[in-house]
């Protein structure tokens, strides 16, 4: 979690002098409670917006908006604390609106916005706006919270953000998978414009089950520049297990901007239409066991052969 570095955030508006300050998320009014405190925010809304940094990078940001209730407690409102909590990491970032002048009622409802919290793709957040000073320990709460889901890099607008592009969102491999015969699977995909290697992860499943009956990893070496954007094809040899017919192919790139954490693309081949009397899967069907210290997938030589070449 971080704040956008540009432009400088502004909270002042007509009729209100205000400045935005970094906050420890522990306002002084927690420690030294006041007798008179303002009511809670009204109509808190969080939306996904996009903003450019000074360097021209595009980031997703949480656009936070709320209004004030039309009661006399605005006379005691000294500011607001905005808090964003990333739910999985438990990381919290806060800023404080410090009012430098007293609020007065006027013809329109007071409305505040803030769009400087940078958020991550595919993450979940809780956004809280606390009016300041915070209430005494047993006082009515004067904050409002809302949860906020940030889409992943498949989302059209997210795809072109800097964090998504860094993880390879612009690469569309357009995978096609074709069963050549009971023992061979052909995978075609488009290479990206980077001299980096790829891995093809094949996982096969019985017709109606989610437990794999065959797994295989195939390494594709880095293409030469003249092969960029070309189609590459690989023929994978399957273990001949009856009923092990649903194949999921996942392609993992290793781009320099994301290394082991690049977006993966996958395609699935369904089992052929079942005959009226399907043959049962034998009890003794061998399932591989990982060697100690190995990755999730065994080496090619344990899995039958495979070969590939690039189309020009």
């Amino acid at each position: 979690l971080r704040l956008l570095d540009f432009p400088a955030p502004v909270c002042a508006q007509e009729g209100l002098s205000c400045r935005v300050k970094n906050s420890t998320c522990l306002d002084d009014s927690w420690i030294h409670p006041r007798n008179l405190t303002p009511s809670s925010p009204k109509d808190l809304q969080i939306q996904l917006h996009f903003a450019h940094t000074q360097q021209g990078d595009l980031f997703p940001v949480a656009h936070i908006e709320w209004t004030l209730q039309t009661d006399a407690s605005i006379l005691y409102l000294e500011g607001a604390e905005l808090s964003v909590l990333q739910l999985n990491t438990n990381e919290r970032l806060c800023v404080r609106f410090e009012f430098l002048s007293k609020l007065r009622h006027h013809h329109r409802r007071w409305r505040f916005t803030f769009s400087h919290f940078v958020v991550d793709p595919d993450q979940e957040y809780e956004v809280t706006v606390h009016h300041l000073p915070k209430p005494i320990p047993d006082g009515d709460p004067n904050h409002q919270s809302k949860n906020f889901l940030v889409p992943d890099c498949e989302h059209a607008r997210m795809k072109v953000t800097t964090p998504c592009m860094s993880s390879g969102s612009l690469w569309d491999p357009n995978i096609t998978v074709e069963t050549l015969d009971t023992q061979h699977l052909r995978v075609d995909f488009t290479l990206w414009n980077e001299s980096t290697h790829y891995q093809i992860l094949l996982t096969s499943f019985p017709h109606m089950e989610n437990h794999s009956c065959f797994e295989h990893m195939h390494h594709i070496p880095a293409p030469r520049p003249e092969e960029f954007h070309q189609r590459s094809n690989v023929t994978l040899t399957l273990r001949n297990l009856k009923g092990c017919c649903r194949h999921q192919v996942q392609i993992q790139p290793f781009f320099s901007s994301c290394l082991n954490d690049c977006l993966r693309h996958s395609a699935t081949v369904s089992c052929p239409e079942m005959p009226d009397t399907p043959e049962p899967i034998p009890d003794y069907m061998p399932l591989w066991e990982p060697r100690s210290g190995s990755s999730d997938y065994k080496d090619d030589d344990d899995k039958g052969s495979s070969h590939h070449h690039h189309h020009h």
Partner: antibody
Framework: QVQLVQSGAEVKKPGASVKVSCKAS????????ISWVRQAPGQGLEWMGW????????NYAQKLQGRVTMTTDTSTSTAYMELRSLRSDDTAVYYC?????????WGQGTLVTVSS | EIVMTQSPATLSVSPGERVTLSCRAS??????LAWFQQKPGQAPRPLIY???TRAAGIPARFSGSGSGTDFTLTISSLQSEDFAVYYC?????????FGGGTKVEIK
Amino acid sequence: QVQLVQSGAEVKKPGASVKVSCKASGYTFTRYGISWVRQAPGQGLEWMGWISAYSGNTNYAQKLQGRVTMTTDTSTSTAYMELRSLRSDDTAVYYCARRQLYFDYWGQGTLVTVSS
Amino acid sequence: EIVMTQSPATLSVSPGERVTLSCRASQSVSSNLAWFQQKPGQAPRPLIYDASTRAAGIPARFSGSGSGTDFTLTISSLQSEDFAVYYCQQYDNWPLTFGGGTKVEIK
């Protein structure tokens, strides 16, 4: 392929405890939280709470507070939900699901029967 | 807590028909709403999140709409595999809550 595989069915006596496991695979375990949802026979879905797989932080439904504990073991990419002081109305299918707000992948469910 | 109310409780329809399911929140949940499909003996399957975004692999015949307190799940042409129970869920605030479900059965 993202998968959440849960432990098998359990039969427990009232007052006992049950611990259900949920083994995750196919993604980086610590990148997402794990939520737990239960469903009594013939009834709807009830949110029980979540645990952050990254920080271990938890958020439990108020009605289960004090009786439920959610934990994770990152070395085995497994989440656990323990429910204590079981009552007959805890009889349900217990599901684990990936994420803390929107549940994009679910386990197959674990039937917990509480009966004397 | 936010109460989610689904209607109708049961819907009897024929394959090929257009189906509209309703979900109402007791207070605004913005667009923080998901829809799930559940068949007997199976875990719920995500269909829609953020009120209108289809989950991965969900056919285009499923669509979601609405914001604030009123939401709709529409199945444009019901297929035989769509007969199931459908649940809405809000994730705007804690505790997360589900609707009671709408059972879509064969007429």
